[in-house]
Interface confidence: medium
């Protein structure tokens, strides 16, 4: 059933054999195969791709490959009643209409079932009114409008540029400001890099290109109708009025050609400063309404999309572990795309496919990993991380007892400059050690390690000679595993140069122009960056599944806990008088962090010295490492966000994509000076310090000697 190799310290030649088997040419071939037609969640095309992947993973040699289906709430435009935005005159005549679709890229003119740009889960409606330009629609943008400029968005249609924060947060902010509709657009300042041509001649966004995307505020709930539980065949579903996270006002996305027509007529207040100006030849006036001659004209939205309960399919592949089959290392990425998915997600799915093929090759030669590896092709990620969340809800009892780690595998590239890693501190040392063993694909770093090029190009802001590793936020399928279940998680991809490229994401994100040719012509012609990402993701999975002692270093958690405690304390110290008045002290938190540091240090010493040939002691030590991430979970969750249960990290309340440290304390302190009841507000700060201090102390004690 197993070879001897599985029980020994990871033999270098096995890791080498696994890495050597990964081929750029295969990734290229798989990417091409996955991107020829759209694979929108809930469609027949995506079901067929699921079955194809199931069949191929079986051929590659996995022990079992199953489809896991769920019936979840999805959203689609009405095929006979298209969504659009108009400028109307005083008689109600439409004098300008936004485009109904993106001009298809060369070679794709005859492809059917390209979903037109829409904001998924927008309610239906035809609001009309004056326009207000709200910059990025961030919390601070609405503060500027409402508090400084005294501009009231109530009853207005707001227009916001994409970028900086998750679009769902923009819509939530607009709703809270009283807006009756939201128009989202891509400004060239954010989606057109200087000196680069627009697609098909380069990787920039053309004027007719539009970013699709969901506008939910799920806060980790998964399917809006079955929060906390799987959307299976006997599920009890909420009514649509009680559904989680749905927007209450119509929302629609447009490109910058159409945005120009709306913004060029804007009157009212001038932009407050240069940070509110994009790159269009318009004044970026805030409004409300149009200027002088056009003041009687209004904007009208026509939104007719429908929400429908639809079947989705995850593909779950298993490679059984030889020694610890009840310990799971998971590699997962999504399969559904908005259109062709050239980058998102298929650049990731192609890498997963090649990783599965390589593991399968080793298995056919008689090798097995020490621990079980699960491979997942998630569905409906674009509609709110639905496939991964429903599967995790269905399997939560197994996962919380057996889950060692989750490695995410969405887009492999968002640029071709250097590596980007976001992960739990437990994985820092694993990532450092692995990247030191891999070759850099970067020009000018021939013969150098990936670690070296990464550190040079993306240095840590705190630790000299080390690369930057960022916090996990959300907006991808690791969310349920990390934020809800407390399973150590990480993600890696190749990214752009953040110093010189200030645009948000990559310009063609979620547009029809995200094609195979975009990747093959402009981002990674040799697929060498894809191969490197495959080596990083695959190498992490290999080590996590095969090393005798789990490759987690708890001392790195101690370091960041101190950093995060310092940071949150410094934020609180903006209010020294209130700290004194309400007797707010961080002593308990700093004490808990100190205890964690000491206990982690002692645990690490014991880890070096224990008898690794004793399977009971080995399992005990590994379980302490595996369950450390779990120990940061508060079963009650964060205030008003029950599915975000990690006390150290949560998605920012102001930007789902970003991670926030000590989020309970951070949110309690946020804008505290504006709270109507300061005593209550500072009481909540104190409660959150107590929760954080207790959790850190409790986590520390899981690392103490067991008896």
């Amino acid at each position: 059933k197993s070879s001897n190799e599985a029980t020994n310290i990871t033999p270098k030649h096995n890791m080498k054999a696994f890495l050597d088997e990964l081929k750029a040419e295969n990734i290229k071939k798989f990417l091409y195969n996955f991107t020829q037609i759209p694979h929108l969640a809930g469609t027949e095309q995506n079901f067929q791709l699921a079955k194809q992947i199931q069949s191929q993973w079986k051929e590659f040699g996995l022990d079992s490959v199953e489809l896991a289906h769920y019936d979840v709430l999805l959203s689609y435009p009405n095929k006979t009643h298209p969504n659009y935005i108009s400028i109307i005159n005083e008689d109600g005549n439409e004098i300008f209409n936004t485009s109904l679709f993106e001009p298809p890229p060369p070679g794709y003119e005859n492809v059917s079932d390209i979903v037109p740009p829409f904001s998924a889960f927008s309610p239906q409606g035809m609001p009309e009114g004056d326009l207000v330009y709200v910059n990025y629609a961030r919390t601070e943008d609405f503060f500027k409008l409402e508090r400084d400029m005294k501009i009231n968005c109530s009853g207005k249609i707001v227009i916001a540029r994409y970028g900086k924060v998750f679009r769902g947060n923009k819509v939530k902010n607009a709703q809270l400001a009283g807006a009756k509709g939201v128009i989202l657009y891509s400004d060239p300042a954010d989606y057109f890099a200087p000196g680069v041509k627009s697609y098909p001649d380069g990787w920039n966004l053309p004027g007719g290109g539009v970013q699709r995307g969901n506008i939910l505020n799920l806060n980790g709930a998964g399917d809006p109708l079955t929060p906390g539980y799987p959307a299976n065949e006997y599920a009890y579903r909420r009514g649509i009025a009680e559904a989680v996270g749905l927007p209450s006002i119509p929302v629609h996305p447009i490109g910058y050609y159409d945005a120009q027509k709306l913004l060029e007529k804007m009157g009212g207040s001038a932009p407050p400063d240069s940070s509110w100006r994009g790159s269009l030849k318009v004044p970026y006036n805030v409004g409300p309404g149009f200027t002088g001659n056009f003041s009687t004209q209004k904007v009208k939205m026509h939104i007719h999309s429908t929400n429908e309960v639809t079947r989705i399919y995850n593909v779950i592949g298993t490679l059984r572990g030889a020694v610890e089959p009840d310990r799971y290392v998971i590699l997962g990425g999504h399969r559904d795309s908005w259109v062709f998915g050239g980058i998102d997600p298929q650049s990731g799915a192609a890498v997963v496919h090649e990783i599965v093929r390589s593991f399968g090759t080793l298995k056919k030669e008689g090798w097995r990993p020490r621990r079980t590896i699960l491979f997942a092709s998630w569905d409906a990620e674009e509609f709110g991380l639905l496939g991964s969340t429903e599967w995790a809800e269905e399997n939560s009892r197994l996962l919380q007892e057996r889950g060692v780690a989750y490695i995410n595998a969405d887009s492999s590239i968002e640029g071709n400059y250097t590596l980007r890693v976001d992960c739990t501190p437990l994985m820092y040392s694993l990532v450092h050690n692995l990247t030191k063993e891999l070759k850099s694909p970067d020009e000018g770093f021939e013969g150098k390690s990936l670690y070296e090029s990464w550190t040079k190009k993306s240095p840590s802001p705190e630790f000299s000679g080390m690369p930057r590793i960022s916090k996990l936020g959300s907006g991808n399928d690791f969310e349920v595993f990390f934020q809800r279940l407390g399973i150590a998680s990480g993600r890696a991809r190749y990214t752009k140069n953040w110093e010189t490229n200030k645009f948000s994401g990559y310009p063609l994100y979620h547009s029809v122009y995200e094609t195979y040719e975009l990747v093959e012509k402009f981002y990674d012609p040799m697929f060498k960056y894809h191969l490197t990402v495959a080596q990083v993701r695959g190498g992490m999975v290999f080590e996590l599944a095969n090393s005798i002692v789990l490759p987690f270093d708890c001392r790195d958690y101690a370091v960041v806990l101190r950093k995060y405690a310092d940071k949150i304390y410094s934020i609180s110290m903006k209010h020294p008088q209130e700290m004194k008045t309400y007797s707010v002290s961080f002593d308990s938190l700093f004490s808990a962090v100190k205890n964690f540091t000491e206990i982690a240090s002692k645990f690490s010493e014991r880890l070096q010295d224990f008898d690794k040939s004793n399977p009971i002691v080995l399992r005990m030590m590994n379980d302490q490492l595996m369950f450390l991430e779990r120990a940061f979970i508060d079963p009650l969750g964060l205030p008003d966000r029950p599915f975000y249960r990690h006390v150290i990290y949560a998605p920012s309340s102001h930007n789902k994509y970003a991670g926030e440290s000590f989020p309970g304390i951070y949110d309690a302190l946020f804008d505290i000076e504006s709270k109507v009841d300061p005593s209550k507000a500072w009481g909540e700060v104190k409660r959150q310090i107590y929760v954080a201090a207790f959790t850190v102390q409790a986590a520390a004690e899981t690392l103490s000697e067991v008896a």
Epitope: K502, D566, S570, M573, G659
Partner: nanobody
Framework: QVQLQESGPGLVKPSQTLSLTCTVS??????????WSWIRQHPGKGLEWIGF???????HYNPSLKSRVIISVDTSKNQFSLKLSSVTAADTAVYYC???????????RGQGTLVTVSS
Amino acid sequence: QVQLQESGPGLVKPSQTLSLTCTVSGGSISNSGYYWSWIRQHPGKGLEWIGFIYYNGSIHYNPSLKSRVIISVDTSKNQFSLKLSSVTAADTAVYYCARDGDDYGDYLRGQGTLVTVSS
């Protein structure tokens, strides 16, 4: 858009104190989401982190430089400063000020200023 600009003498004598100021424009240094760093790059070498400061004075220094470094902030002028005492030729480098946070998009760096330590 936030911009950072370093200023200070380009030549410092050995054993003296190197003083640099970073002026932040287009955004407030008081934003609690960020910390403000000094970094240096020796000729032909990688970047070396010197230290960072929150606007309220909470500071972290690189342990290897801690005894010689003072970083301070002046929120009224939207500036933060670096003082490095007892300099030697080994402190010759391009000095950068930077804004940082925990997200990739937060990182911004000034143009840098070359400081030569020589008599």
